[in-house]
Amino acid sequence: WSSKVLMSSANEDIKADLILTSTAPEHLSAPTLPLPEVQCFVFNIEYMNCTWNSSSEPQATNLTLHYRYKVSDNNTFQECSHYLFSKEITSGCQIQKEDIQLYQTFVVQLQDPQKPQRRAVQKLNLQNLVIPRAPENLTLSNLSESQLELRWKSRHIKERCLQYLVQYRSNRDRSWTELIVNHEPRFSLPSVDELKRYTFRVRSRYNPICGSSQQWSKWSQPVHWGSHTVEENPSLFALEA
């Protein structure tokens, strides 16, 4: 196969998460206890965890989770095949990547199997719930005598889907300098002082071209550049205040 690029994609508007909770329409003789809210996160589009607070149940109850996509050919829910447990009580469900569709409305139903009328349905936009892995393989190189370039890699997810937050500071700085880098896994620092020791770290989020996730990944492992003879010294900061 050969490839050629014809045009670049427009960045369409992305709707925010929609969460709706409802209970069954049956007439109940006694008020039903509300079910805990289900929270779902898609981890690097490798798997998804949907969890709930099982300790909010007055009695130890193995709640069941069923899910489907709004668009699916039949409207039947499928039950979770891989439950997560807390103190031997169901507290979540892990869904594998084959079952993840980011751009279809994900419908999740939590139910008390002992009281079938006690159920809650939520609708989620998974594209806004992606948490990438921390960036990896941070490498520093000199572009010129005083200019540094930092590069990194993301695993599994295309770079165009990611936005990065780069932080750096020298051993003389109290706080981090930070900036957003969109889609390109590189950043250059035009002027560095070779007498200082710099530390860099990066994190990423699935935003804004492919989704609108506000959740950042964990920080990468930090990388360092510069004089290794000067160590960070908190007392120095106090003197400079």
Epitope: K4, L6, V71, H156, K158
Partner: nanobody
């Protein structure tokens, strides 16, 4: 629900042309990869052409220079213009759609197994 409906197949003499269409609904078209595949009797389904959301296109070597894949986002329709058809192009032609190529690095546009949604197919017969 997701629907893909092919049309435009038929019988044609070698050297002739056909234009296949695939009307789609039920998914955000601008976030999906679309592919044309074909399956001749007794053979495995094979990739013919694919197009990514950004408009990037890929072709099987056997159709390069003869087939053109395109899409009309306004009407959510995929096309395959087939020129200089050969008897070996005879097959059932399917269109397929999937979102994962939009965000996954390791997505292979050529593999039928990567695609989640499929049409019913349209028959193309080329006689010599």
């Amino acid at each position: 629900q997701v629907q893909l409906q092919e049309s435009g197949g038929g019988s044609v003499q070698a050297g002739g042309s056909l234009r296949l269409s695939c009307a789609t609904s039920g998914f955000p078209y601008s976030r999906y990869c679309m592919g044309w595949f074909r399956q001749a009797p007794g053979k495995e389904r094979e990739g013919v052409a694919a197009i990514e959301p950004d408009g990037s296109t890929s072709y099987a070597d056997s159709v390069k220079g003869r087939f053109t894949i395109s899409q009309d986002n306004a009407v959510n329709t995929l096309y395959l213009q087939m020129n200089n058809l050969k008897p070996e192009d005879t097959a059932m032609y399917y269109c397929a759609a999937d979102e994962r190529c939009f965000y996954l690095k390791d997505y292979d546009l050529r593999r039928p197994a990567q695609y989640r949604y499929w049409g019913q197919g349209t028959q193309v017969t080329v006689s010599s």
